[in-house]
């Protein structure tokens, strides 16, 4: 007789003891049920301490089950930030590696003299890539300024060209535009494509801060009650072999997971922005196009510099005065053989498509993550029954469970008949981490259409706090440059998760 | 007006690292490259380095390759010089300069700190 | 590395003489050169750079000249402050090198 055999506790005994907690608590046979808090109040093989014992666990194999969802999601957004990463630094340096391979024979002393300030330019757009608070306008402004200092005093030993003249011819530069369209394309593709790159990497970043985040969220004491009652009151209760209703283990989870649940809204529009700025790294003004070919603009401007440099003299002299010549001085520089270089549209490579294909094709996997939650978790952890019959553990026995599934979200739990969710209190942290995936969104919109959202007066009406964590050494606070120290808003998000490789040693 | 402040003096046994430090105002710190020239007592100057504030790049004359590591802090707008492994001839004093414009030329100088090294 | 070499090492000279001291590369460095003076216990102080522009402050008593490997730095008409230490420098390239230094004494 199957009630009788219930009433001996040997199944309870062998489900407690698994986990590892001590026999000497499990009563031989059914107890009064009185002292339940948690579980219904009939005859019961749980004493308090056992009841105590099963409701910790089962939060704990919650909050389990719900790092484990997270992990995997962070490991697939990581690991996107990664493939990403590594192509669009190994597209920069590249585009270095040729420059320092080349330029020496194409250019001689006009690139060896001026070395360190091509090899500063590359730092440059690899901090900025990185998430540094530099301006990139003007970081490509003041390459160009040095360099046609520099170049200016190589291409004319012959004259004396002390600071203020430099000044003058400072000043005059850009309405002589020595070095033809090189810079003002540069600055055009340049600003786009990296900031295309930087912010679709970043939004990786930040998705993947917001889940690690959000995973850390605790469940709070309702929802350990509601988890209790779902996992090990069948047990308590004699019943071991009922598994949860459907529908009941999504309510309880549902109620849970509330707060969770908001992110949905502002999760989605931070996957849809990203898949759409991949459209930006295709093209002539695309990431791979522009990134990789650095170099190709430098050149350029050098032989328009070198070609135009009797017309841009006469006009420095026009605007500047008559430098005085150096008695000792060599004449004048020889014109070089303009400098020949690899075209200037990179051939893709098929390496970004294939990561583009496979990053959309998983960011849409994970689109609906926070309120398929509940029902995965359910079906994944909860050992539920196949179907709502009446034979599945309703929380008070066997039998069909009734109530209606809850919607999504906290203000749909008002009448969750399995948790007590209190909705006019939203938690702080998710509230923080919606408003993290606010402000990515927005910056990835403002880079969708070429601009840097963090040098626009843009007041992101976020507090500071939550994830703004992944600034990577001084790099969020500095600015750079030599004519302005214009203050800036720092960046709220850097590259999280990816080391810093500045400083290197040269010699 | 620029400005380069440097550490105070300091006393060091052979064997131990000293960490100077060099603290600039009165101009953009990340546009100008900075550099450290030591002067042995009665002796010539030599350049031991360079760094670059913005990026944190750097480029070190080889003899203190394997020994010295410059950085920055650009919250601070200072810039430090650590040798490493002192031995009684790293007795000089540490000057920091900074470049006139982006070529090379130190038109401004920190007071210098006197590094002794003795056992 | 770029050696440079400096001569005299020490000179004496009276207030209104006129004084040059000689720097020569071990190549050609164009004109990029640089002169210091420095007096006991102070810092060195920029006098000339690019081989022959004076640096802002400085007295017009001091001029440079030179280029490729062979630089001069005169002074007109020498003061009694101008007592010190001269180096040359090359700012070519790293890494950056000096003479060893020309001391002006006056008598």
């Known amino acids: 007789d199957p009630a009788s055999k219930s009433r001996s506790c040997g199944e309870v005994r062998q489900i407690y003891g698994a986990k590892g907690f001590s026999l000497s608590d499990v009563p031989q046979a059914e107890i009064s049920g009185e002292h339940l808090r948690i579980c219904p109040q009939g005859y019961t093989c749980c004493t308090s301490e056992m009841e105590e014992n099963l409701a910790n666990r089962s939060h704990a194999e919650l909050e389990t089950a719900l790092r484990d969802s997270s992990r995997v999601l962070q490991a697939m957004l990581a690991t996107q930030l990664r493939s990403f990463d590594d192509h669009f630094q190994h597209l920069l340096n590249d585009s270095e590696r040729t420059l320092q391979a080349t330029f020496p024979g194409a250019f001689g002393e006009l690139y060896t003299q001026n070395a360190r300030a091509f090899r500063d330019l590359y730092s440059e757009l690899r901090l900025y890539y990185r998430g540094a608070n530099l301006h990139l306008e003007e970081t490509l402004a003041e390459f160009w300024a040095r360099l046609l200092e520099r170049l200016f005093k190589q291409l004319h030993p012959q004259l004396l060209l002390p600071d203020d003249y430099l000044d003058c011819l400072g000043k005059q530069a850009e309405a002589l535009r020595p070095f033809g369209e090189a810079p003002r394309e540069l600055r055009l593709r340049a600003t786009r494509a990296f900031v295309a790159a930087r912010s679709f990497v970043q939004g990786l970043g930040v998705a993947s801060d917001v889940v690690r985040k959000v995973a850390q969220v605790p469940l709070g004491p309702e929802c350990s009650r509601a988890v209790m009652k779902l996992v090990y009151c069948a047990h308590c209760l004699g019943v071991p072999g009922a598994r949860p209703c459907p529908d009941y283990c999504r309510n309880v989870l549902k109620g849970c997971l509330a707060n969770q649940a908001d992110l949905d809204a502002e999760w989605r529009n931070l996957l849809d922005s990203m898949v759409l700025i991949t459209d930006k790294f295709w093209g002539t003004s695309g990431v791979e196009s522009v990134i990789g070919s650095v170099h190709t603009w430098l050149a350029e401007a050098i032989n328009a510099l070198q070609d135009n440099r009797d017309t841009l003299t006469a006009k420095v002299i026009q605007g500047c005065g008559n430098p005085k010549v150096n008695p000792q001085g060599p004449g004048p520089e020889e014109k070089r053989r303009r400098g020949k270089l690899a075209p200037r549209e990179r051939p893709p490579s098929g390496t970004l498509e294939k990561l583009v294909s496979e990053a959309k094709a998983q960011l849409r996997d994970v689109q609906d993550f926070w309120i398929s939650l509940p029902g995965t978790l359910c079906s994944e952890k909860m050992a539920l029954s196949t179907a709502s019959d009446d034979r599945c553990w309703n929380g008070m026995a066997r039998g069909r469970y009734l109530p209606e599934v809850m919607g999504d979200g906290l203000a749909n739990q008002i009448n969750n008949p399995e948790v007590e969710v209190d909705i006019t209190k939203p938690d702080m942290t998710i509230r923080q981490q919606i408003m993290q995936l606010k402000i990515m969104t927005n910056r990835l919109r403002s880079a969708y259409n070429g601009n840097d959202v963090d040098f626009q007066d843009a007041s992101d009406d976020g507090s500071g706090s939550g994830s703004g964590d992944g600034c990577l050494d001084d790099l969020c606070s500095r600015k750079v440059s030599r004519k302005s120290s214009s203050s800036r808003t720092p960046l709220t998000h850097a590259l999280p998760g990816l080391s810093e490789q500045e400083g290197q040693k040269t010699s | 007006q620029v400005q380069l402040v440097q550490s105070g003096a300091e006393v060091k046994k052979p064997g131990a690292s000293v960490k100077v430090s060099c603290k600039a105002s009165g101009y953009t710190f990340t546009g100008y490259y900075m550099h450290w020239v030591r002067q042995a007592p009665g002796q010539g100057l030599e350049w031991m380095g360079e760094i670059n504030p913005s990026t944190g790049d750097t480029t070190y004359n080889q003899k203190f390759k394997a020994r010295v590591t410059m950085t920055r802090d650009t919250s601070t707008s200072t810039v430090y010089m650590e040798l490493s492994s002192l031995r009684s001839e790293d007795t000089a004093v540490y000057y920091c300069?900074?470049?006139?414009?982006?070529?090379?030329?130190?038109?401004?100088w920190g007071q210098g700190t006197l590094v002794t090294v003795s056992s | 590395d770029i050696v440079m070499t400096q001569s005299p090492s020490s000179l004496s000279a009276s207030v209104g003489d006129r004084v040059t001291i000689t720097c020569r590369a071990s190549q050609g460095i164009r004109s990029a050169l640089a002169w210091y003076q420095q007096k006991p216990g102070k810092a060195p102080k920029l006098l000339i750079y690019d081989a022959s522009n004076l640096q802002s402050g400085v007295p017009s008593r001091f001029s440079g000249s030179g280029s490729g490997t062979d630089f001069t730095l005169t002074i007109s008409d020498v003061q009694a402050e101008d007592f010190g230490t001269y180096y040359c420098?090359?700012?070519?390239?790293?890494?950056?090198?000096f003479g060893q230094g020309t001391r002006l004494e006056i008598k």
């Open positions: 300069a900074r470049e006139k414009r982006d070529d090379g030329v130190f038109a401004y």
């Open positions: 420098q090359q700012s070519f390239g790293p890494p950056r090198t």
